[in-house]
């Protein structure tokens, strides 16, 4: 069967059930429903999934049976619209049910909430988890899929199946171990951190497709796959890009069964043709399906072919540049991007896309000029400042990170970003700045050749988090501008923002800076978040505060928490010393 070129099926639901198997079918339908109806109880979703599964089985038995010819959107949408409490729980989302497909599905997609009002997931005691796992393994694993999917409505569904497989393996192994906690907790921490990263990366892919269109996503994919598979022909990269775009379009559009099926086909194709694609795929291709797809997605860059010719000859020096460009603009620009990217694994994808955009803009202008060749002859010189800007920024920030360490580096970024966009909510500023600060430990350890792709492409993912959170409740024109003008220039746009001089400082509220003994029982991470929340609030009260002033106040604050957490009567200490700290801080900052 050729990849994605399927025979017409009488029953789409039967076709997907047979392709995916019952276990994956049920898991994917559960993910789809939880990503759409994020507030519904687990039991309600399980009931809906079981009903859909039973229906699918009737269609497998007889594809001509009643309703089996309906589209998956129609079947799933009809099922979601049977939820009795839709209006009370979701408000205007219930209006989607009055629409016909495809408008109804688009309506559901628009109501996905990147920051749903759900309680933080609290991890129970290890023995409690192991008992639950042994009592009903299937329900335990479904609950995992449900809880992740409803909190991450754009999580890459086939990849979530891979996470669930690892989650199951961790419990299977560790619940039999002598020291269950020592075995299990690090594995769960790793899955949580990897899961958050995977969710954020996929969120950027969906934002790229939904906000900037297929062409933007394809350009990103050409650049990334050309870096990863530099020995592959342009047509091979183009074919992979087309197929990958289809997979992600489906997943971002809620078509999770098609997405998972097509992703499996793509992995199969890549492994069958690995000799033409990359020498690094051998190990990946020996793994089972879910591991194989994950491994391919993360595979290291292949070695660059030796003796690649200079790009200048055909893209700058040739008199035929405008003729070649005019013949098929996107193919020519795609070849430029492919050729540039395979020679530059040391560049970030967003930098490569900026270079390609500069090249395109130059050709658009010059190919209409009196002397095109003279006009575009110096186009590569325009690349130099574009390359140096991220290089210098990364160098400066890695030096700062090495000097300060992660926590204080995060604090420096908190101050920097709060001054740039003080209107943004404090929890968002804390979350985004903490993640921006993680770029240090993630990327600064790498040699020069790997720093930029690591750092700038990671920053693109984190800034997209800011963009999607801000889009839900827009409060800053500057954030909207940086988020919407250009996908590849988001990071330079935010970097270029200076202190917002139009901002009216927030009124001082002593309650914001009142702390209690409960801070003493928090984990180190939670305590940091409390302190960083206070720091953001300080900057919002006093945006013109100097680094030195803020450092002094934060040092006093850290000493105050340490002192009161050692006190016999902690609550009294927090009340009395807290008042003194607030007064001293106001004086120090001139509030």
């Amino acid at each position: 069967r050729g990849v994605f070129r399927r025979d017409a099926h009488k029953s789409e639901v039967a076709h997907r059930f047979k392709d995916l198997g019952e276990e994956n079918f049920k898991a994917l339908v559960l993910i789809a429903f939880a990503q759409y109806l994020q507030q519904c109880p687990f039991e309600d979703h399980v009931k809906l999934v079981n009903e859909v599964t039973e229906f699918a089985k009737t269609c497998v038995a007889d594809e001509s049976a009643e309703n089996c010819d309906k589209s998956l959107h129609t079947l799933f949408g009809d099922k979601l619209c049977t939820v009795a409490t839709l209006r009370e729980t979701y408000g205007e989302m219930a209006d989607c049910c009055a629409k016909q497909e495809p408008e109804r599905n688009e309506c559901f997609l628009q109501h996905k909430d990147d920051n749903p009002n759900l309680p933080r997931l609290v991890r129970p005691e290890v023995d409690v988890m192991c008992t639950a796992f042994h009592d009903n393994e299937e329900t335990f694993l479904k609950k995992y899929l449900y809880e992740i999917a409803r909190r991450h409505p754009y999580f890459y569904a086939p990849e979530l199946l891979f996470f669930a497989k690892r989650y199951k393996a961790a419990f299977t192994e560790c619940c039999q171990a002598a020291d269950k906690a020592a075995c299990l907790l690090p594995k769960l921490d790793e899955l949580r951190d990897e899961g958050k990263a995977s969710s954020a990366k996929q969120r950027l892919k969906c934002a790229s497709l939904q906000k900037f269109g297929e062409r933007a996503f394809k350009a990103w994919a050409v650049a990334r796959l050309s870096q990863r598979f530099p020995k592959a022909e342009f047509a091979e990269v183009s074919k992979l890009v087309t197929d990958l775009t289809k997979v992600h379009t489906e997943c971002c559009h809620g078509d999770l069964l098609e997405c998972a099926d097509d992703r499996a086909d793509l992995a199969k194709y890549i492994c069958e043709n690995q000799d033409s694609i990359s020498s690094k795929l051998k190990e990946c291709c020996e793994k089972p399906l879910l591991e194989k797809s994950h491994c391919i997605a993360e595979v290291e860059n292949d070695e660059m072919p030796a003796d690649l010719p200079s790009l200048a000859a055909d893209f700058v020096e040739s008199k035929d540049v405008c003729k070649n460009y005019a013949e098929a603009k996107d193919v020519f620009l795609g070849m430029f991007l492919y050729e540039y990217a395979r020679r530059h694994p040391d560049y970030s994808v967003v930098l490569l896309l900026r270079l390609a955009k500069t090249y395109e803009t130059t050709l658009e202008k010059c190919c209409a000029a009196a002397d095109p060749h003279e006009c575009y002859a110096k186009v590569f010189d325009e690349f130099k400042p574009l390359v140096e800007e991220p290089q210098n920024l990364i160098k400066q920030n890695c030096e700062l990170f090495e000097q300060l360490g992660e926590y204080k580096f995060q604090n420096a970024l908190l101050v920097r970003y709060t001054k740039k966009v003080p209107q943004v909510s404090t929890p968002t500023l804390v979350e985004v700045s903490r993640n921006l600060g993680k770029v240090g430990s993630k990327c600064c350890k790498h040699p020069e050749a790997k720093r930029m792709p690591c750092a700038e492409d990671y920053l693109s993912v984190v800034l997209n988090q800011l963009c999607v959170l801000h889009e839900k409740t827009p409060v800053s024109d500057r954030v909207t501008k940086c988020c919407t003008e250009s996908l590849v220039n988001r990071r330079p746009c935010f970097s270029a923002l200076e202190v917002d001089e139009t901002y009216v400082p927030k009124e001082f509220n002593a309650e914001t800076f009142t702390f209690h003994a409960d801070i003493c029982t928090l984990s180190e991470k939670e305590r940091q978040i409390k302190k960083q929340t206070a720091l953001v609030e300080l900057v919002k009260h006093k945006p013109k505060a100097t680094k030195e002033q803020l450092k002094a106040v934060m040092d006093d604050f850290a000493a105050f928490v340490e002192k009161c957490c050692k006190a016999d009567d902690k609550e009294t200490c927090f009340a009395e010393e807290g008042k003194k700290l607030v007064a001293a801080s106001q004086a120090a900052l001139g509030l």
């Epitope: 022909e233 342009f234 047509a235 091979e236 183009s238 074919k239 043709n273 000799d275 033409s276 072919p305 690649l308 010719p309 790009l311 000859a313 055909d314 893209f315 003729k323 070649n324 013949e327 098929a328 193919v331 020519f332 795609g334 070849m335 430029f336 492919y338 050729e339």
Partner: nanobody, 125 residues
Amino acid sequence: EVQLLESGGGLVQPGGSLRLSCAASGNTYLTSCMGWFRQAPGKEREGVSSIYTVGGSTFYTNSVKGRFTISRDNAKNTLYLQMNSLRAEDTAVYYCAAGSPARCRLRDPTTFDYWGQGTLVTVSS
């Protein structure tokens, strides 16, 4: 339309060299991906080497890497294949082919749109 005309085939001893040429005429953009294929008696047509006339990137099948070199002269609209250290198993009819760079894949002859008539290369002592 595009016409492709190969030349340079012949009889050569094992270890010897030959240089094949392929002259292209017509819409040259349609030939911006060019390649050499070969077909030995009773065997399937297989890709030998390809080149993009924009960018200049080259690709070779494993069995000829280090022995064959593909090149092009854009001004003359001519494609070349320099074949050194020839072996008996290189005996075949060699075809020049052309197509769009967005489609042409060396392992798949069907992705090339235009073909020459072929030139015979015989490696024998």
